[in-house]
Amino acid sequence: EEELQVIQPEKSVSVAAGDSATLNCTVSSLIPVGPIQWFRGAGPGRELIYNLKEGHFPRVTPVSDPTKRNNMDFSIRISNITPADAGTYYCVKFRKGSPDVELKSGAGTELSVRAKPSAPVVSGPAVRATAEHTVSFTCESHGFSPRDITLKWFKNGNELSDFQTNVDPAGKSVSYSIRSTARVVLTRRDVHSQVICEVAHVTLQGDPLRGTANLSEAIRVPPFLEVTQQSMRADNQVNVTCQVTKFYPQRLQLTWLENGNVSRTEMASALPENKDGTYNWTSWLLVNVSAHRDDVKLTCQVEHDGQPAVNKSFSVKVSAHPKEQGSNTAAENTGTNERNIY
């Protein structure tokens, strides 16, 4: 008597998530009498996938009619495949008895599920950094299979090379995750810059997924300060200007000090944007020279984006101002203690 063979012709089958998978199995003989059962996995922890005799298997249907006389084809179709269905499936022949006795197993068919990666999510640093500093951006995508995946980083369309990528887990799994961290050196011109994380996978048919992050969320461009004096007005008032230029973000507080005492505080708001995304702001202070006997030390103090204040001082020489109207002014910028603290 020829020994019964259980034939699973495919060693592996790959199916896209959502599709149906056909797992083929034929037997070489009609005897001995007994059922075929399908299992996922082997050993005591194996899961029963299909048993014609009993049980409810809504997603599994036999390919051919198993009740038909002389049927030797016990292939099954599993509908609406998900990554959780991945594994090795065994077609197992039992001999009829009480209970049925396991007789022979097929060699197994490994089902792998092709699943698309999720849209890449790019996150930037928690705190802003200034130009010339390096910041890290992280890109994450999940739920894809198979494991092979390509990830690229771009800054304003130019490919970046300083990044590190990990795909987890290392071994075989139903689905995988990718995490990549790119290091980007900031420049003062990066307010309008963008980093893009691009993920390519076999399931995407050459149309990669992209995640973006704006460098405007990561950068701080500290202001330049310049204090200048306009010519004396007819009413003995000197107009002193503090020009705050090329800063980002807009969050800025400017305080005028006269001889160390707070004269006025202003908050920047609704400023027009420069082409490069930075902002400028000009503040004026009128000083009544006739009200002072000595020189007046004016300080423009700027606190930008919660950083330590930056000062620029300027001395108005009272002695140099004759009291008659229309005379020229002689002003001297004494305070060059500008501090840019990052």
Partner: antibody, heavy 122, light 112 residues
Framework: QVQLQESGPGLVKPSETLSLTCTVS????????WSWIRQPPGKGLEWIGF???????FYQSSLKSRVTISLDTSKNQFSLKMTSVTAADTAVYYC????????????????WGQGTTVTVSS | DIVMTQSPLSLPVTPGEPASISCRSS???????????LDWYLQRPGQSPQLLIY???SRASGVPDRFSGSGSGTDFTLKISRVEAEDVGVFYC?????????FGQGTKVEIK
Amino acid sequence: QVQLQESGPGLVKPSETLSLTCTVSGGSIRDYYWSWIRQPPGKGLEWIGFIYYNGRTFYQSSLKSRVTISLDTSKNQFSLKMTSVTAADTAVYYCARVRAYSGIGLDGTDVWGQGTTVTVSS
Amino acid sequence: DIVMTQSPLSLPVTPGEPASISCRSSQSLLYSTGYTYLDWYLQRPGQSPQLLIYGGSSRASGVPDRFSGSGSGTDFTLKISRVEAEDVGVFYCGQALQTPLTFGQGTKVEIK
């Protein structure tokens, strides 16, 4: 080449919980059983239990009420927790991989960790 | 539970000579599929056990061919055709047919 590495405290007080982790490197968690086996000083091998990659667990009946084996596929790790330990639980604890190709049985414990000595003492 | 019994428990050997260890199970390890769920392990001094034989007679990867396993049902034998000095240690048989997995008491092989 698959390697297994046990980690966890070497000394546990009586009545406390023993916690060990086994890290799988160079291979996959899938399609295998992941086992804990112990060996008391000068004695033979005692199977504690194992977990299949699908999460199904099997335990030694005498230890079942005290033992939990869990799997973290994202970290390629599996763990053993044993509550209410006594001096009788002092042993070298091995994590190991058990193969299963087809059928109901298993095909040998083919990869073993180097073992970690756990002493139960106050 | 399936009880595994080994004999002898101690085996003095001479390098170059053959040696054999017996193992008996309390119930048959020959499954209906024709597969025998019996494994042999060697634990060298200070080391973890290593798989020598699985399925009653199949040599594990990297195991020298001087080791062979035989038997079926409840009686099994591990043979070493020519003992080498590196073969010293404790040999265990183990069944993998059903949980709990069980092992024999071990046979200590030492050079005479």
